[in-house]
């Protein structure tokens, strides 16, 4: 769980390579866990700076530690997921709260404990990388402050929210154990995909996660994106945006949670003293204080909750999955005590769910969310969170049912709308998804101002020929989700040169280009031989990018890993490429043959990251009818010649020839990425 700089990680949860394979796939969502960065161009704040943190509740370990900026970012993140989860943010409140109603009878915790999440490894993140990466896939967001819970509760002291306008720095985050799925916007897909582990490679992981949790010493690096925090946990993004709409404000304000039962009121002074330490960032002292309170008053829900929060903070500070697992257990203990105030019960279980998601324990989180909904059946925000829980394990059908239920009761719930629209889009119900995505974003509700929703709304509109698409891309850009209207990738490192088309000289990879062009016939012949003898190695494009037609790919490298079986089919090509680490080591790209048959149209779409450039070597190019547009310039391929473009910019392909088109695609690291960044960025 070692953290990475918040800032660094913000937006980068890719770090969480649960299985250690360096994949950043599954949306890195998990990994990203909510890193919702605001603007691609914002400078990242150095991780160190991010550490101080005044928000007690925010003091979530990795998430909370950051400074304002980070906090915000975190918050954003948290917000995101959390918002996604619709966390009800309540304003800070003192321990002094009155007694709250006790939670409804709790069911046994066993169900929780049965969660099947196994891999709890928290790889350690290293704050070495400081690229601000802005990733916007749909993942669970890393929470920043101890979750809205904390925010919500913020009960004890009055803490200021971090400045929401500050850029978020790359954060270091804890890693997910990635035992499950997350939803993400991979390329164009509007699908919550299983988390594949995006991340950074873990060092020395010896045993299976269950038996051998990754030690805190293992280090993983992640990239981060930086955005000014937009959605703080307690405030919906729109609100942050300075809304004067009283209704909006009303939405945000909530009654203070009541966290003390009668007994805890009698020990309030002791609880306050311990909480003060936590809020001041004296985490180790606070851990001791709350630990002693639990020893002294084992039936005190508030003391137990304070201990959980301190462990949560400590986990973040130490970037330790191990400590975080302890916090998750302690949050559960709170819920199992007698006479727990309902607000405290809700906060504790919500935070538990959030931290489980953070660790990648999506199924365990789902069980926690199901329990919350059972305990608080009238709380719409919890149902929204439950929907996210289903999405994170790839159960879109149940998520859809949850959001249908929410919308039947509260038809204007923006959070439910965007998520419902997201699901419809994933189900290829393009036209149906548009009003939900659009109205959801327009609601300004917490959790709706997320790049993924702008991404899919615009894409849906483009696919039905609605020219409003670019209005939404423009708005997404203005709100910091996209680098520009054309460049809409979600996993970005800020500050990289951005242009749609590149010349070999501009890339600096002239030797690679020369080698490809000199050997194009060899490359072509091996590709044709595979087509002829092992056509099954060419797999159809499966990201729903085609309007029509037939398009398949034969991949030699992906995520920086050579496919040995594939290379048996194209051995000379693979040998040739081994000399060029800028491509074979590009963990955010692929090397593959791409065959497209006549009558194919690939919708305008955007790649996932600005960290790569894409080379296309023409191998078999029909005389007419094949073209590619990137941004606002259209080009054609030539046999034996390389075209280079940045696929983080919108691009579109047409194949209207009378015979197949075969090209060889070679992704390379963006030339401005440093060696350190290339080593540490999670795979995609």
């Amino acid at each position: 769980f070692d953290l990475v700089d918040y800032e660094e990680v913000l937006g980068k949860l890719g770090i969480y390579d649960a299985d250690g394979d360096g994949d950043f796939d599954v949306d890195d969502a998990k990994v990203l866990l909510g890193l919702k960065e605001r603007s691609t161009s914002e400078p990242a704040v150095p991780p160190e700076e991010a550490e101080p943190h005044t928000e007690p509740e925010e003091q979530v370990p990795v998430e909370a530690e950051p400074q304002n900026i980070e906090d915000e970012a975190k918050e954003q993140i948290q917000s995101l997921l959390h918002e996604m989860v619709h966390a009800e943010h309540v304003e800070g409140e003192d321990l002094q709260q009155e007694d709250g109603p006790t939670g409804e009878p709790q069911q046994e915790d066993d169900e929780f404990l049965m969660a099947t999440d196994v891999d709890d490894r928290f790889e350690t993140l290293e704050p070495e990388v400081s690229h601000e990466e802005t990733e916007h896939s749909y993942h669970v967001e890393e929470t920043v402050s101890q979750d809205c819970n904390q925010d919500m509760e913020e009960m004890m002291s009055e803490q200021e929210n971090p400045d929401s306008s500050e850029p978020v720095v790359e954060d270091e985050r804890l890693h997910h154990d990635t035992d499950d799925v997350t939803y993400q916007v991979y390329e164009e897909q509007a699908v919550y995909e299983p988390l594949e582990n995006e991340g950074i490679e873990i060092t020395e992981v010896t045993a299976p996660p269950e038996d051998n949790p990754v030690e805190d010493s293992q280090v993983i690096v992640e990239e981060v994106s930086i955005f000014p925090v937009e959605e703080q946990q307690e405030v919906p993004p729109e609100t942050n945006r300075k809304t004067d709409d009283p209704e909006q404000k009303a939405k945000v304000k909530k009654k203070k949670p009541k966290l003390l039962n009668k007994f805890d009121k009698t020990i309030k002074a002791e609880l306050d003293a311990a909480e003060k330490l936590r809020k001041r960032g004296k985490i180790e002292e606070a851990v001791n204080a709350f630990k002693e309170l639990v020893r002294k008053y084992p039936q005190s829900p508030r003391a137990r909750y304070g201990k959980a929060q301190c462990e949560d903070d400590l986990a973040e500070k130490r970037r330790s999955n191990e400590v975080l697992r302890g916090a998750i257990e302690t949050y559960q203990e709170v819920a199992s005590l007698p006479d727990v105030p309902a607000d405290l019960l809700k906060l504790s279980l919500k935070r538990r769910s959030d931290r489980q998601q953070f660790l990648g324990h999506m199924r365990g989180s789902l069980l926690t969310l199901q329990r919350l909904v059972q305990l608080f059946p009238n709380d719409t925000s919890l149902k929204n969170d439950l929907g996210v829980g289903y999405l994170l394990i790839g159960d879109n059908d149940n998520a859809k049912k949850v959001y249908e239920e929410v919308l039947s009761v509260t038809p204007n719930d923006g959070f439910a709308k965007v998520h419902y629209g997201f699901i419809l889009k994933a189900q290829n119900k393009i036209a149906e998804s548009i009003p939900y995505l659009k109205e959801g974003i327009e609601s300004g509700d917490p959790g709706t101002d997320d790049g993924r929703f702008y991404f899919h709304l615009g894409d849906a509109m483009q696919r039905v020929g609605n020219k409003e698409a670019y209005k939404w891309y423009e708005l997404g850009h203005k709100r910091g989700h996209f680098a520009s209207v054309w460049q809409r990738s979600l996993y970005n490192v800020n500050g990289l040169k951005a242009q749609p088309w590149w010349t070999p000289k501009e890339t600096g990879y002239t030797e690679l280009v020369k080698s490809l062009e000199r050997n194009w016939k060899l490359i072509r012949d091996e590709g044709l031989a595979v087509m002829d003898k092992a056509k099954g190695l060419f797999l159809p494009e499966d990201e729903n990018l085609r309007e029509k037609g037939d398009w398949s790919q034969f991949t030699l490298w992906q995520q920086g890993r050579r496919n040995e079986n594939a290379c048996k089919g194209a051995p000379k090509t693979c040998t040739l490429l081994e000399k060029f680490p800028e491509t074979t080591g590009c963990r955010r790209g692929q090397i593959k043959y791409s065959i497209m048959h006549p009558g194919t149209h690939v919708w305008p779409h955007t790649g996932p990251t600005n960290c790569r450039l894409r080379m296309h070597l023409g191998l078999v190019i029909p005389k007419e009818g094949c073209k590619i547009r990137c941004a606002n310039e259209t080009k054609t391929w030539e046999e034996g010649k390389v075209l280079i473009f940045d696929d983080s910019f919108e691009h579109e392909v047409w194949q209207d020839a009378s015979s197949f088109r075969l090209i060889f695609i070679v992704d390379v690291w963006h030339p401005e990425l440093t060696p350190q960044q290339r080593r540490s960025l999670p795979a995609i």
């Epitope: 269950e210 851990v287 002294k296 302690t330």
Partner: antibody, heavy 119, light 108 residues
Framework: QVQLVQSEGGVVQPGRSLRLSCAAS????????MHWVRQAPGKGLEWVAV????????YYTDSVKGRFTISRDNSKNTLYLQMDSLRPEDTALYYC????????????WGQGTLVTVSS | EIVLTQSPGTLSLSPGERATLSCRAS???????LAWYQQKPGQAPRLLIY???SRATGIPDRFSGSGSGTDFTLTISRLEPEDFAVYYC?????????FGQGTRLEVK
Amino acid sequence: QVQLVQSEGGVVQPGRSLRLSCAASGFTFNDYAMHWVRQAPGKGLEWVAVISYDGSNKYYTDSVKGRFTISRDNSKNTLYLQMDSLRPEDTALYYCAREASSGWYIDSWGQGTLVTVSS
Amino acid sequence: EIVLTQSPGTLSLSPGERATLSCRASQSVSSSYLAWYQQKPGQAPRLLIYGASSRATGIPDRFSGSGSGTDFTLTISRLEPEDFAVYYCQQYGSSQVTFGQGTRLEVK
């Protein structure tokens, strides 16, 4: 590295008193709760007492309540166990031990001090 | 007071074999509060597992812990000669710490 060095034990007559000490080094003593655990010859481990990091809270196993007192001097990085009204059944090897910072388990142990209560 | 009962009292196995030691609590124990220790003759105990399943620093990965509620298990996947010792489970609850009576693991 964490070190817990215990004082010498000895033979004591029933009803008499003895004070054990444990000098800690290699860690921030005042951040940790500390325990005494004993082990009678040929027997298993038995927890005796714990004291909070700041000395404000103390807890004992039932069999020693009212007779034993755990204390600490954080300025000297030292833990004590004052044993009064000793009984033959208190004969054991006494271990000074450090509780983990955020858990309830013991992560470091002293070498042990043998206390023999016999007439 | 929670009573921990370990079984078997003595386990006789050969190096290379798998050892499974059980610890049963008289009432439910939070997994966060269950630990396992190893003690060799003439030495102080050594922490092996905490939080029911987390290995302490420096403990080989052949040692693993599992369980929840009232039933906990320590497993040594492949016994090494140095693993023959006495093993104790320990729990914390309501300001009281209790140890199991121990399981002696001896060479067959």
